[in-house]
């Protein structure tokens, strides 16, 4: 069975690849150059930490959490790492561009590397509705489309709604899961026979994607307060996160155990719920004011994942052909929905006991913040869909889904591996 | 008490450089965000930059973005504000001011006396 | 570039009640553009006065109090005194950045 690419993407892929990262090396030339002033070197290995975080959950957590598939472990985990590269790349110019550009050049910071980081990260989320059905030249595509579209959402909701990074960058959740799930529905769906056993997790991936949990796990805090202006509100974040996903990893393990008929804990079910709580409170963890009410919303986060990944894999992989092991995409929706109603209540508790007015218009602002992103998320993800669906791409077949031989070079070429 | 001097101010030649600092001290210096706004004669206040607690982000007014720089050094409580190709118009006494943000708050609470620049040929 | 503004001037007496009004180009004010409220008497720095629309400071005379109206930001003066005769701005944060903006100031006048 032949390893190679077909040869018409073995002339696309590099071709287009190398183009783009020229182009982006001349951007990077004309338009960009580093912030020239003095720092406290303190304050600076401090602020590359939080960056160094976001970079271990992206290409750690979120490159093997997508890793359980039997025979696709291998382009899970090098596939999100190529993405983040890309990702972060043009990410960098797109904010610059959008942010800074009437002073002529793009100021490169520690915290715009950050901001690129994040951005860079909704592909990664997203992604999980279609890997193993796409190749790498798709994929480049679904990196161009998203960090723009998800940088014009970001400006757009900056602007109209005068939001700050931290609830701008929030949206990440709800926009992502629902660019992935729109993308997905456009791919071809049905796999043929013989090839069932590809989409099934296997035990050494399914490990890999326990990893890919932990780091994930970990960080989360760090996601959460990135983007916070101040160490009061970096504190309450990271502490309410913490709270949440610790909450969400009980709640996981036994919700599972409760939902199968022989008590049984299902390892798919644990990959997301774990993160369930972070999800649940990335809008509002600055706004939470104490422990417990972090820990409620992990509580019904966990629960929330549990059932939607016990009752919701089955209608999406017959509406929108994702495999089982996939339940990203439906579970960040849920959850970023979760997330954004607990920051509306939360508002309107803080509105009302301010005593302003108003409170109808605030509500109503954060209802459009949230209806924009998630129409700008579905028509981009059916552009980047339709876009995937071109003949040009030479997409893999869907007998070859989930299939790492398709992709990469094995010396033994054995099934099992 | 919380205490903010600006000093470096002074009269300089248009394209020329200036820059000016900022002391702070009656509070920890590394736990705030910090803001330099301007006034020109008889004029109103102008927003000019703000700088993170930790100096991770700042961010400038349209009219000083390229040319003026705003940095901190939590080392020493001081503030700065590093401003090249200076022009007639920026010509004010420029106020350095003390940032609270938490949560759903944000306040300019404590401000220097003030330094005045006067660019002039 | 937003634009905020302010009346540009104000006439009270003594004893009375005074409203200052704060409004956005870019339509109606909320409480996430933070408004702060601020007093100069000449010569002098400014003073905080209200923050985050209605938190007072410390040092804030109970007098002044800060509230949304009619989609402004607003200050209320009530049993104005003749030391309140200054020039008030207001402040409001915008975008993603949150860069601040100011009002072309009030100049309030007790007569």
């Known amino acids: 069975m032949s390893s190679k690419y077909p040869r018409s993407v073995r002339r696309c892929l590099p071709l287009w690849a190398l183009t783009l990262e020229a182009a982006l090396i001349l951007l990077f030339y004309f338009f960009t150059h580093y912030d020239a002033s003095l720092e406290d070197q303190k304050g600076l290995v401090a602020s590359y930490q939080v960056g160094q975080d976001l970079t271990v959950m992206a290409a750690i957590g979120l490159g093997f959490l997508t890793s359980s598939f039997r025979r696709h472990s291998w382009s899970s985990v090098a596939f999100n790492l190529f993405m983040l590269a890309l990702g972060v790349q043009w990410a960098i110019l797109l904010d610059g561009f959008l942010s800074q550009f009437p002073s002529g050049k793009v100021v490169i910071t520690l915290f715009s590397i950050r901001l690129a980081t994040m951005s860079a990260l909704s592909v990664l989320i997203s992604v999980d509705a279609v890997l193993g059905k796409v190749n790498l030249a798709q994929l480049v595509v679904m990196v161009l489309v998203e960090v723009t579209a998800l940088g014009n959402l970001r400006m757009v909701i900056s602007n109209i709604f005068n939001t700050d990074y931290h609830m701008n960058m929030m949206h990440i959740y709800v926009f992502a899961a629902y660019f992935g799930l729109s993308v997905a529905w456009c791919l071809p769906k049905p796999l043929p026979e013989g090839t069932e056993d590809k989409d099934q997790t296997a035990t050494i991936p399914s490990l890999s994607a326990m990893l890919g949990a932990l780091f994930l796990w970990m960080f989360w805090p760090s996601f959460n307060s990135a983007l916070l202006r101040s160490p009061i509100e970096r504190k309450n974040a990271v502490f309410n996160t913490y709270y949440a996903v610790a909450v969400s990893v009980v709640t996981a393990i036994s919700g599972s155990s409760l939902a199968h008929p022989q008590g049984k804990i299902s390892k798919t079910y644990v990959h997301s719920a774990v993160l369930a709580g972070g999800v649940a409170v990335g809008t509002s963890c600055h706004l939470i004011p104490s422990p417990w009410l972090a820990m409620v919303l992990g509580l019904v986060a966990g629960l929330i994942s549990v059932g939607g990944a016990k009752y919701l894999p089955g209608c999406c992989n017959r509406v929108l052909g994702i495999p089982h092991s996939s339940i990203m995409g439906y579970n960040f929706s849920l959850l970023g929905l979760l997330g954004e109603i607990i920051y509306i209540v939360l508002l309107v508790l803080d509105t009302v006991g301010a005593g302003n007015g108003m409170i109808g218009f605030q509500v109503l602002l954060s209802i459009g913040e949230l209806s924009l992103a998630i129409v700008i998320a579905l028509m981009s993800g059916l552009l980047t869909g339709l876009l995937l669906n071109l003949k040009i791409w030479k997409a893999p077949h869907e007998a070859k889904y989930f299939d790492d031989q398709v992709f990469w070079k094995f010396p033994h070429l054995a099934v099992g591996f | 008490e919380v205490q903010l001097v600006e000093s470096g101010g002074g009269v300089v030649q248009p394209g020329r450089s200036l820059r000016l600092s900022c002391a702070a001290s009656g509070f920890t210096f590394s736990s705030y965000g910090m803001h330099w706004v301007r006034q020109a004669p008889g004029k109103g206040l102008e927003w000019v930059a703000v700088i993170w607690y930790d100096g991770s982000n700042k961010d400038y007014v349209d009219s000083v973005k390229g040319r003026f720089t705003i940095s901190r050094d939590n080392s020493k409580n001081t503030l700065y504000l590093q401003m090249n190709s200076l022009r007639a118009e920026d010509t004010a006494v420029y106020y350095c001011?003390?940032?609270?943000?938490?949560?759903?708050?944000?306040?300019?609470?404590?401000w220097g006396q003030g330094t005045l620049v006067t660019v002039s040929s | 570039q937003a634009v905020v503004t302010q009346e540009p001037s104000l006439t009270v007496s003594p004893g009375g009640t005074v409203t200052l009004t704060c409004a956005s180009s870019?339509?109606?004010?909320?409480?996430?553009?933070?408004p702060n409220w601020f007093q100069q008497k000449p010569g002098q720095a400014p003073r905080a006065l209200v923050h985050?629309?209605?938190k007072k400071h410390s040092w804030t005379p109970a007098r002044f109090s800060g509230s949304l109206l009619g989609g402004k930001a607003a200050l209320t003066l009530s049993g104005v005194q003749p030391e309140d005769e200054a020039e008030y701005y207001c402040l409001l944060f915008y975008g993603g950045a949150q860069l601040g903006v100011f009002g072309g100031g009030t100049k309030l006048t007790v007569l």
């Open positions: 870019t339509g109606a004010v909320t409480t996430g553009y933070y």
């Open positions: 001011a003390r940032e609270l943000a938490k949560g759903r708050l944000r306040d300019l609470d404590h």
């Open positions: 985050s629309t209605s």
